[in-house]
């Protein structure tokens, strides 16, 4: 029985971009303006979403598609379909609610977005730190001391444990 | 040995899809970051995309974003690149690549650079 | 146009030493780790040298890498007729949140 209703449903012959008129015995009427149908068979068009303040238009809404919002510069995408707006910080830095700071040491962020986290920990894979981190960036790990002879070709020795002008914080 | 085979590409018209795969053997796919890297003819390499394997953070190039989507299924060692609203300047070569720095241990694949790399699949876009 | 600036071209007669640079900014090489690549014809790039100036094992000691500020260089020594091929730095770039590659310095051995 409900096959058989849908197949006579004149609503099912409305396109995307159209929604079915029920005030105009359920012709096809094309979506009115900021607003937009994705499937066919509807019987309402949506709103289209508005990029407003923070939010910019990344994608104009048509009469078959929603549209897609960005953020200003100085601000990333947060949620689904970017819902949120979140602001940058520099790379070293986190976004706390004081606004941002620069990373503890010990701590980095190579991004714009996110939290500070822990240097990686060299000692957990059996490797030595080839590189020192920074607040910008990671420790990068070599070869375990075990596999370095003299001359290895990839292995400088480790630098200082504390790079000129990161003291902690 | 880190193998990395690219297959889905193909000739497509302006407008239209492809789905581009890359299996994964002889490392823990699971552990790394992945990208995608193509080359035009003739012309430089250019990133694409990133997906991280422990937060499944995904980054895009500019070129890119809103069209392409980036995905992996780590239970099948595999790769995945959907693009979508193909363009002419999309056509490339693409390569899928695997990043150095197994993770979590390794908290920034950056410094490691893209250890591994695919012999690539030809995109067309054409009418 | 690439956020990595390298020269198109580079040349060099075989035992000879070749510099090929990398110039960028703050948000990329200033304060990031710089890659190398090498691409021979018709293949794909291989990892040539990681975190500015380490070499993965298996790349000989002729090549090196350097930074300095926002450049980075790729040093070859005793240039050989099978280091003909395109040599690109990449880094990742905080601002554009990706990675980026220069368009690549091609080599030739004279």
């Known amino acids: 029985f409900e096959r058989t209703r849908s197949l006579q449903d004149p609503c099912s012959n409305c396109p995307a971009g159209t929604f079915c008129d029920n005030n105009r015995n359920q012709i096809c009427s094309p979506c009115p303006p900021n607003s937009f149908s994705s499937a066919g068979g509807q019987r309402t068009c949506d709103i289209c979403r508005q990029c407003k303040g923070v939010f910019r238009t990344r994608k104009e809404c048509s009469s078959t598609s929603n549209a897609e919002c960005d953020c200003t510069p100085g601000f990333h995408c947060l949620g689904a379909g970017c819902s949120m707006c979140e602001q940058d910080c520099k790379q070293g830095q986190e976004l706390t609610k004081k606004g941002c700071k620069d990373c503890c040491f010990g701590t980095f962020n190579d991004q714009k977005r996110g939290i500070c986290r822990p240097w990686t920990n060299c000692s957990l894979d059996g490797k030595s730190v080839l590189v020192n981190g920074t607040k910008e960036r990671d420790v990068v790990c070599g070869p375990s001391p075990a596999d370095l002879s003299p001359g290895a070709s990839s292995v400088t020795p480790p630098a200082p444990a504390r790079e000129p002008g990161h003291s902690p914080q | 040995e880190v193998q990395l085979l690219e297959s889905g590409g193909g000739l497509v018209q302006p407008g239209g899809s492809l789905r581009l795969s890359c299996a994964a053997s002889?490392?823990?796919?699971?552990?790394?970051?992945m990208s995608w890297v193509r080359q035009a003819p003739g012309k430089c390499l250019e990133w694409v995309s990133v997906?991280?394997?422990?937060?499944?953070?995904?980054y895009y190039a500019d070129s890119v974003k809103g069209r392409f989507t980036i995905s992996r299924d780590n239970s099948k060692n595999t790769l995945y690149l959907q693009m979508n609203s193909l363009r002419a300047e999309d056509t490339a070569v693409y390569y899928c690549?695997?990043?150095?720095?197994?993770?979590?241990?390794?908290?920034?694949?950056?410094?490691?650079?893209?250890?591994?790399w695919g012999q690539g699949t030809l995109v067309t876009v054409s009418s | 146009q690439s956020v990595l600036t390298q020269p198109p071209s580079a040349s060099g007669t075989p035992g000879q030493r070749v510099t090929i640079s990398c110039s960028g900014s703050?948000?990329?090489?200033?304060?990031?780790?710089v890659t190398w690549y090498q691409q021979l014809p018709g293949t794909a790039p291989k990892l040539l040298i990681y975190?500015?100036?380490h070499r993965p094992s298996g790349v000989p000691d002729r090549f090196s890498g350097s930074k300095s500020g926002t450049s980075a260089s790729l040093a070859i020594s005793g240039l050989r007729s099978e280091d003909e091929a395109d040599y690109y730095c990449?880094?990742?770039?905080?601002?554009?949140?990706?990675?980026?590659f220069g368009c690549g310095t091609k080599l030739t051995v004279l």
């Open positions: 002889g490392f823990t796919f699971s552990g790394y970051d």
């Open positions: 990449a880094t990742w770039d905080y601002s554009l949140s990706g990675y980026v």
């Open positions: 997906i991280y394997p422990d937060d499944g953070n995904t």
């Open positions: 703050s948000s990329n090489i200033g304060n990031n780790y």
């Open positions: 690549a695997k990043h150095g720095g197994q993770k979590p241990t390794t908290k920034s694949s950056s410094a490691y650079g893209m250890d591994g």
């Open positions: 975190a500015d100036s």
